[in-house]
C-alpha cells in the first residue's frame, strides 16, 4: 500500500493514484505560475532514475518559505521510504548543477508523465 494519509489523501491509495495526484499537483504549479516560482530559488539538479522521489524531496526540502511547493514536498515524502530533512543529500544529486525550482518542477513533471504513460507506478 502507498500510505499518503494525513496530509493529502484520505488514507492509503494505490501507487498509480498517488503518482497521478503528484503529477496533477505539478501541473497545477506550472499552470498557476505568475511570478518566478519560489522567488527564483535554486536547487540541486537530480538524476531522474531509481530513488528519484527521495532525491527530489532532498532537493526541494531546502527551499523554505515557498507555499507553492509545500504540497509537493508533502506528497513526495509519501513516496520516500525514509525521513528526509534539510541539508541531506544522496548520490542522486548532480552536485555541480543548480537549477531554478520552476525548471526542476518542469523536468520532474515531464519525467513523471513518461513513467505514468509507461505504467511504471512503483
Amino acid at each position: 500500500l502507498t500510505c499518503l494519509g494525513g496530509f493529502a489523501s484520505p488514507g492509503p491509495v494505490p501507487p498509480s493514484t498517488a503518482l497521478r495526484e503528484l503529477i496533477e499537483e505539478l501541473v497545477n504549479i506550472t499552470q498557476n505560475q505568475k511570478a518566478p516560482l519560489c522567488n527564483g530559488s535554486m536547487v540541486w539538479s537530480i538524476n531522474l532514475t531509481a530513488g528519484m522521489y527521495c532525491a527530489a524531496l532532498e532537493s526541494l526540502i531546502n527551499v523554505s518559505g515557498c507555499s507553492a511547493i509545500e504540497k509537493t514536498q508533502r506528497m513526495l515524502s509519501g513516496f520516500c521510504p525514509h525521513k528526509v530533512s534539510a541539508g541531506q543529500f544522496s548520490s542522486l544529486h548532480v552536485r555541480d548543477t543548480k537549477i531554478e525550482v520552476a525548471q526542476f518542477v518542469k523536468d520532474l513533471l515531464l519525467h513523471l508523465k513518461k513513467l505514468f504513460r509507461e505504467g511504471q507506478f512503483n
Epitope: L1, A8, V13, P14, S16, V27, F121
Partner: antibody, heavy 118, light 107 residues
C-alpha cells in the same frame, strides 16, 4: 445532484472520426477526473482515458494514436474523439467521474450507443 | 495490463438465495478492487470499493471480500431488483481494467 449525459452520432461509417460529448450538470468539471469507458457488444468494458481538473490527459496505451479527450469548461462538457473508426469501435460509450485520490467510478452517464457500419 | 477474470459469466438463482461472484486478477492488486451493478437498460452503479467497502446507499445484503488476486461479491437474500450484470474493476494500475461481467437472472 451530479448528472452525466453522453451524446454521439448513433451511426458512423468506417474511417470516420467519432465525436462524442458528455454534458455534466450539478458539478464542475474543474474538479476531479472525467473518464471515458466503452462497453462492446457482449458486455466487455474497456477503459479509454481521462481528462483531469487541470486539463491534463491520460489515454489507454492500446488507443493512444486513435483517441483525444478535450473539454470546454464554460459549457461544462467533455469530448471524446476517436479517429479512423472501424466496426470494432461499435460500442456504448460512457463518461464517468472519478474523485481525487480515488480509483473507482462513483458516477456514470447513461451512455450513448455508436454503431460503425458501412 | 492487469487481466481481470470474472466467473461465472452467467448465473441463475432463486429469490432469497445467496449468490457469490468471483474475480481473479492476473497480478497482486492488494485491495484495489471495486464492483459495479448494471441493470438492463440502465447505467452502471458503484456497489463496493476497496474490495469490501460499501458505497453510499447500497443495501447491506451486498458484501465484498478478498485481497491480492482473489475477490468475491456476495449477494444474500436475493431480491427481484438484483437482476443485473455485475462487473469487477482493478484500480491498482493504469490502464484500469474490468472483469468480463456476470449476468444474474432469477429462476
Amino acid at each position: 445532484e451530479v448528472q452525466l449525459q453522453e451524446s454521439g452520432p448513433g451511426l458512423a461509417k468506417p474511417s470516420q472520426t467519432l465525436s462524442l460529448t458528455c454534458s455534466v450538470t450539478g458539478y464542475s468539471i474543474t474538479s476531479d477526473y472525467w473518464n471515458w469507458i466503452r462497453k462492446f457488444p457482449g458486455n466487455k468494458l474497456e477503459y479509454m482515458g481521462y481528462i483531469s481538473y487541470n486539463g491534463n490527459t491520460y489515454y489507454n496505451p492500446s488507443l493512444k494514436s486513435q483517441i483525444s479527450i478535450t473539454r470546454d469548461t464554460s459549457k461544462n462538457q467533455l469530448y471524446l474523439q476517436l479517429k479512423s473508426a472501424t466496426t470494432e469501435d461499435t460500442a456504448t460509450y460512457y463518461c464517468a467521474r472519478l474523485a481525487k485520490w480515488t480509483w473507482y467510478f462513483d458516477i456514470w452517464g447513461t451512455g450513448t450507443t455508436v454503431t460503425v457500419s458501412s | 495490463d492487469i487481466q481481470m477474470n470474472q466467473s461465472p459469466s452467467s448465473l441463475s438463482a432463486s429469490l432469497g438465495d445467496t449468490i457469490t461472484i468471483t474475480c481473479h486478477a492476473s497480478q497482486n492488486i492488494n485491495v484495489w478492487l471495486s464492483w459495479y451493478q448494471q441493470k438492463p437498460g440502465s447505467l452502471p452503479k458503484l456497489l463496493i470499493y476497496k474490495a469490501s467497502d460499501l458505497h453510499t446507499g447500497v443495501p447491506s445484503r451486498f458484501s465484498g471480500s478478498g485481497s491480492g488476486t482473489g475477490f468475491t461479491l456476495t449477494i444474500s437474500s436475493l431480491q427481484p431488483e438484483d437482476i443485473a450484470t455485475y462487473y469487477c474493476q482493478q484500480g491498482q494500475s493504469y490502464p484500469y481494467t474490468f472483469g468480463g461481467g456476470t449476468k444474474l437472472e432469477i429462476k
